[in-house]
């Protein structure tokens, strides 16, 4: 149904080996990054914190899908993870490696 | 070509009458809102200011399109416009009505 397909956060586990980042990220082997999936149809729900532009774009798309694309479901808040990584050959621990995991999705 | 279809800002003129907002926005009759269109394929260009999460998601999509959706081309910077509008029956001027026009697009 439309509601089930609406913009929301869904699981996405990243294996660093799979994307070739194990060459510099020593630990962890992977992490739950999540992703934002689903549609942003008008009217845009408040919890998706739409900008005025997103509301207008969604409204234009509703009236004429040729004129404007839909607003897009994207991360609006990201959180850090901790990593052990190689920095110029030095194994370094970083408690907060920013912008790695989605905590909130919204329509933009 | 792929480059021509890459994430960028494109024109989108909004006519307030068309979207029914002429009932409360007195002037202007419309404005250039722009929109963000195009794909966010890996590797994501620097000018599209991708987050680490967007880079990872694009990379996962490249390797397995079933596992993750593409990163999305969205407004990353919005600018205000000036409007004359009705506020409880009073015609009011707002110099900076925020978040109305796209000034930059990026991959998120």
């Amino acid at each position: 149904n439309a509601k089930g397909n609406y913009c929301k956060r869904t699981p996405l586990y990243i294996d660093f080996k799979e994307i070739g980042w194990d060459s510099w990220i020593i630990a962890p082997p992977g992490y739950e990054a999540y992703e934002c999936r689903g549609v942003c149809n008008y009217p845009l729900a408040e919890h998706l914190t739409p900008t005025k532009h997103a509301i207008i774009q969604a409204l234009v798309h509703l009236k004429n899908s040729q004129k404007a694309s839909k607003a897009c479901c994207v991360p609006t808040k990201l959180e850090p993870i901790s990593i052990l990584y190689l920095d110029k050959g030095v194994v370094t621990y970083k408690f907060k490696y920013e912008g790695m995991a989605v905590s909130e999705c919204g329509c933009r | 070509n792929a480059k021509g279809n890459y994430c960028k800002r494109t024109p989108l003129y909004i006519d307030f009458k068309e979207i029914g907002w002429d009932s409360w926005i007195i002037a202007p009759p419309g404005y250039e809102a722009y929109e963000c269109r195009g794909v966010c394929n890996y590797p994501l260009a620097e000018h599209l200011t991708p987050t680490k999460h967007a880079i990872i998601q694009a990379l996962v999509h490249l390797k397995n399109s079933q596992k993750a959706s593409k990163a999305c081309c969205v407004p990353t910077k919005l600018e205000p416009i000036s409007i004359l509008y009705l506020d409880k029956g009073v015609v009011t001027y707002k110099f900076k009505y925020e978040g109305m026009a796209v000034s930059e697009c990026g991959c998120r």
């Epitope: 962890p28 901790s82 050959g89 408690f95 995991a101 | -």
Partner: antibody, heavy 115, light 111 residues
Framework: QVQLQESGPDLVQPSQTLDITCTVS????????VHWVRQPPGKGLEWMGT???????DYNSAFKDRLAISRDTSKNEVFLKMDSLQTDDTAVYFC?????????WGQGILVTVSS | QFVLIQSDSMSTSAGSTVKLSCKRS????????VYWYQQHEGRSPTTMIY?????PDGVPDRFSGSIDSSSNSASLTINNVQIEDEAVYFC??????????FGGGTKLTVL
């Protein structure tokens, strides 16, 4: 305030499985990492594994085949499960919070492996 | 895989300065940060030094960490040693194999 508390059996039979729970309070498991470290009587510290804040798990390869670490973020619990215990697995088992550094430890639980 | 080698025990007198050593068996000591932990008898460890030379809040500035490339060792120096400094001190480092490696510990006795 921040606390970590290990709970589990004091005594385990050889060849049996050890289950320890680390219950945390005062912080989120999605923000901080949790180490499992053990210390045999009169001996040094040995890192066993880490439950990372992003959900990834690392193990000391010395335990990899018989050790499993997991968590329940809603209950603020981290679990250690180790199979096929032998007498030399007798130790104090600690969980510890890793932020910018290891800033909080549980008080430890002494597990004796004996028949 | 490297190991971190610490002397089993050391004695010192109150008020003096003592330097505890942590030698890396293979590879460069500078290729990962060294952390130092203090453990009193029957207690959980506490971090004294992290990222090689940083002190957590509450750790006296009598404690300092350093690296000596010539001996491929990290050192924990304690100035003006106090009775309450009597404890076992463990160094710890990182590797790409066993991610978190502890030294065997040095028991410091204050006379």
């Amino acid at each position: 305030q921040v606390q970590l508390q290990e709970s589990g059996p004091d005594l385990v039979q050889p060849s049996q499985t050890l289950d320890i729970t680390c219950t945390v309070s005062g912080f989120s498991l999605t923000t901080y990492n949790v180490h499992w470290v053990r210390q045999p009587p009169g001996k040094g510290l040995e890192w066993m594994g880490t439950m990372w804040n992003g959900g990834g798990i690392d193990y000391n390869s010395a335990f990899k085949d018989r050790l499993a670490i997991s968590r329940d973020t809603s209950k603020n619990e981290v679990f250690l499960k180790m199979d096929s215990l032998q007498t030399d697995d007798t130790a104090v088992y600690f969980c510890a919070r890793l932020g910018y550094y290891v800033d909080y430890w549980g008080q430890g639980i002494l597990v004796t492996v004996s028949s | 895989q490297f190991v971190l080698i610490q002397s089993d025990s050391m004695s010192t007198s109150a008020g003096s300065t003592v330097k505890l050593s942590c030698k890396r068996s293979t590879g460069n000591i500078g290729s990962s940060y060294v952390y130092w932990y203090q453990q009193h008898e029957g207690r959980s460890p506490t971090t004294m030094i992290y990222d090689g030379d940083k002190r957590p809040d509450g750790v006296p500035d009598r404690f300092s960490g350093s690296i000596d490339s010539s001996s491929n060792s990290a050192s924990l120096t304690i100035n003006n040693v106090q009775i309450e400094d009597e404890a076992v001190y463990f160094c710890q480092s990182f590797s790409s194999g066993i991610k978190f490696i502890f030294g065997g510990g040095t028991k410091l006795t204050v006379l």
